[in-house]
Interface confidence: low
């Protein structure tokens, strides 16, 4: 007899069992079910991608063979039934017709049937062998796939482990960074507070220093004068003693010329031995009228009388004729010394004029005129300049020949416009000319394309407003 069974073994694999008479054939086939599903941490396609490309074909071919095997099995079962039925009939007939002695014929039929069965069994054995070969091949392939999959799984597990390690490390570092940021913020805040405190302290100290500097200058001047007076007194005493002890002494006492205690300019102060830059009191020539001026005792050998300074826009330079005549501002900062004093001073002896310039990019330049003087007020303080040298001196930025001085209320320029009103500040405007160091002060980033700014054309062009300027004078024979 023969039958065919399909079942599942204890490992969950499908098994195919064919029983043919006393022989029983069992086929254990690996299943694709054993692959992990996509819900697994590792996607199934990631593994299958490395499997041989003919795997699906093999499975299909196996299914075809299964179908053939089933068909053959069913055909054998039908044949078996047919034989059994026929045998029953034949046996009855034999029993009924035993007398007729047809045994030989029956044996022949039986033999024929047996031969057919044997042939069929051989065919089935061939099919089984084919199935076994195919199964073995598939098993080998699947074994290779399994090994490959195991390797991949191991690699993935290693990588995952590595990723987890890195993630942990990253989290640790992130926490560290956050902690550092927190500390940094605290430190910054602390530093800001310290900075603010220091700024307050610095500003306090600055004002104290300013006061001390002023006191020092005054003390220095007083000290120098006292020393001179003491020296004079000693000389006078000695002179008197000599006269008293001399038998041929005359009754009249030679009175020494009074020591100079007034100064016309910073050069005289410098030559008197006072060589510290600062604010000093100057006296108008041939007069007792005084004026405060800043003396630069360091730059270019010292002895410079500052007649103009711009540095921060703290002083308004759009002033009247009278203000420009007598001067305005603060000698320690932005100021104009005064046209009347400068005119009187520069007409007493020959002076040089140095103009020092600073731009917003940190560059510095200067123009030096070897001879400078201002006419009197009757001639509108007209400027006279000759002998130009310096780093900003290809062409004079103060128009030649010299122009009259103009202010917002006294228009003496060569333009039908009013240059001082339009360009701001008092200056020796031409029409309106290539310079104006008394123009509107513009801060950085707002200092370009300004026609009314602090201009020195032959250094920075027409629309550039300078950061700082200083005009200073000194005797030519210093």
């Amino acid at each position: 007899y023969s039958n065919f069974r399909k079942s599942v073994d204890s490992t969950g694999r499908r098994q195919y069992q064919v029983q043919n008479g006393p022989c029983s054939y069992t086929f254990l086939l690996p299943e694709t079910d054993s692959c992990r599903s996509s819900s697994s941490p590792y996607m199934s396609n990631a593994v299958q991608r490395d499997a041989p490309l003919d795997y699906d074909d093999s499975v299909q071919r196996l299914q075809v063979l299964e179908n053939i095997l089933e068909n053959n099995t069913q055909w054998l079962m039908k044949l078996e039934n047919y034989i059994q039925d026929n045998m029953k009939k034949e046996m009855v007939e034999i029993q009924q017709n035993v007398v007729q002695n047809q045994t030989a014929v029956m044996i022949e039929i039986g033999t024929s049937l047996l031969n057919q069965t044997a042939a069929q069994t051989r065919k089935l054995t061939d099919v089984e062998a084919q199935v076994l070969n195919q199964t073995t091949r598939l098993e080998l392939q699947l074994l290779q796939h399994s090994i490959s999959t195991n390797k991949l799984e191991k690699q993935i597990l290693d990588q995952t482990s590595e990723i987890n390690k890195l993630q942990n490390k990253n989290s640790f570092l992130e926490q560290k960074v956050l902690d550092m940021e927190g500390k940094h913020s605290e430190q910054l805040q602390s530093m800001k507070e310290q900075k603010d405190e220091l700024q307050v302290l610095v500003s306090k100290q600055s004002s104290v220093i300013d006061e001390l500097e002023k006191k020092l200058v005054t003390a220095t001047v007083n000290n120098s004068l006292l020393q001179k007076q003491q020296h004079d007194l000693m000389e006078t005493v000695n002179s008197l003693l000599t006269m008293m002890s001399s038998p041929n002494s005359k009754s009249s006492v030679a009175i020494r010329k009074e020591e100079q205690t007034t100064f016309r300019d910073c050069a005289e102060i410098f030559k008197s031995g006072l060589t510290t830059s600062g604010i000093y009191t100057l006296t108008f020539p041939n007069s007792t009228e005084e004026i405060k001026a800043y003396c630069d005792m360091e730059a270019g050998g010292g002895g410079w009388t500052i007649i103009q300074r711009r540095e921060d826009g703290s002083v308004d330079f759009q002033r009247t004729w009278k203000e420009y005549k007598v001067g305005f501002g603060n000698p320690s900062g932005e100021y104009w010394l005064g046209n009347e004093f400068v005119s009187q001073l520069t007409n007493q002896q020959r002076y040089v004029l140095k103009i020092h310039l600073k731009d917003w990019e940190g560059n510095e330049a200067y123009s030096l005129y070897e001879h400078f003087y201002l006419s009197s007020e009757e001639l509108n303080y007209r400027i006279h300049l000759t002998g130009l040298t310096g780093t900003a001196a290809k062409i004079s930025s103060i128009s030649q020949p010299g122009s009259d001085f103009s202010t917002k209320d006294s228009d003496n320029d060569k333009c039908i416009c009013k240059c001082s009103q339009m360009l701001s500040g008092g200056w020796w405007f031409d029409a309106c000319g290539p310079s104006n160091l008394n123009g509107q002060y513009y801060p950085q980033k707002q200092n370009t394309n300004k026609f009314n700014g602090i201009k020195w054309y032959y250094w920075k062009g027409s629309g550039y407003s300078l950061k700082a300027t200083t005009m200073m004078i000194r005797p030519a024979d210093f």
Partner: antibody, heavy 120, light 106 residues
Framework: EVQMVESGGGLVQPGGSLRLSCAAS????????MSWVRQAPGKGLEWVAN????????YHVDSVKGRFTISRDNAENSLFLQMSSLRAEDTAVYYC?????????????WGQGTLVTVSS | EIVMTQSPATLSVSPGERAILSCRAS??????LAWYQQKPGQAPRLLIY???TRATGIPARFSGSGSGTEFTLTISSLQSEDFAVYYC????????FGQGTKVEIK
């Protein structure tokens, strides 16, 4: 005395070219921005172009950009306007004018003008 | 561009009378406005700049006022030599003129 005299105007066909000149005297040309301003017959004034003291910056009104070019020769105290691809609408009296100060666009001195006629 | 509009186009005034000319800017130009006078066959002449400052040599009868977008030129007592065309011009952003106001004898 400040004086400016234009020359070079005349009749020209559409698409043609002309070069206007302005001779300046009585002031130092190199110290001023200079401009060309035009006036169509019976119409208003229109600023055409200007040029910085040293010639390093030039500006033109949109309607003439690419066709007109302003230039100067400070050594010769002269201002120029090269005009090409002329159109009928360029017909006008062309004045050269001195900018009062640093491109403020205030014209304190003007020439008497030169007439440019573009017609076929 | 900034458009300058003048009104009226023509103003008829008798000698000795006051003339008021208006100029409007399409956007604020602060006080960056000038007035020019032009007589037939002549070049323009600068009268006022900065909206209200008279140029050198300009008689006191000419005065300017306004800021932002509305400006006025006033001729307090018209003289025979004042009959001409008057142009306003802005120099706040590039340079543009109004179309002009003709002041004629009434």
């Amino acid at each position: 005395e400040v004086q400016m005299v234009e020359s070079g105007g005349g009749l020209v066909q559409p698409g043609g070219s002309l070069r206007l000149s302005c001779a300046a005297s009585g002031f130092t040309l190199r110290s001023y921005w200079m401009s060309w301003v035009r006036q169509a017959p019976g119409k208003g004034l229109e600023w055409v172009a200007n040029i910085k003291e040293d010639g390093s910056e030039k500006y033109h009104v949109d309607s003439v950009k690419g066709r007109f070019t302003i230039s100067r020769d400070n050594a010769e105290n002269s201002l120029f306007l090269q005009m090409s691809s002329l159109r009928a609408e360029d017909t006008a009296v062309y004045y050269c004018a001195r900018d009062m100060e640093a491109s403020a666009g205030l014209f304190d001195y003007w020439g008497q003008g030169t007439l440019v006629t573009v017609s076929s | 561009e900034i458009v300058m509009t003048q009104s009226p186009a023509t103003l008829s005034v008798s000698p000795g009378e006051r003339a008021i000319l208006s100029c409007r800017a399409s956007q604020s130009i602060s006080s960056n406005l000038a007035w020019y006078q032009q007589k037939p066959g002549q070049a323009p002449r600068l009268l006022i700049y900065g909206a209200s400052t008279r140029a050198t040599g300009i008689p006191a009868r000419f005065s300017g006022s306004g800021s932002g977008t509305e400006f006025t030129l006033t001729i307090s007592s018209l003289q025979s030599e004042d009959f001409a065309v008057y142009y306003c011009q802005q120099y706040n952003y590039w340079w543009t003129f109004g179309q002009g106001t003709k002041v004629e004898i009434k």
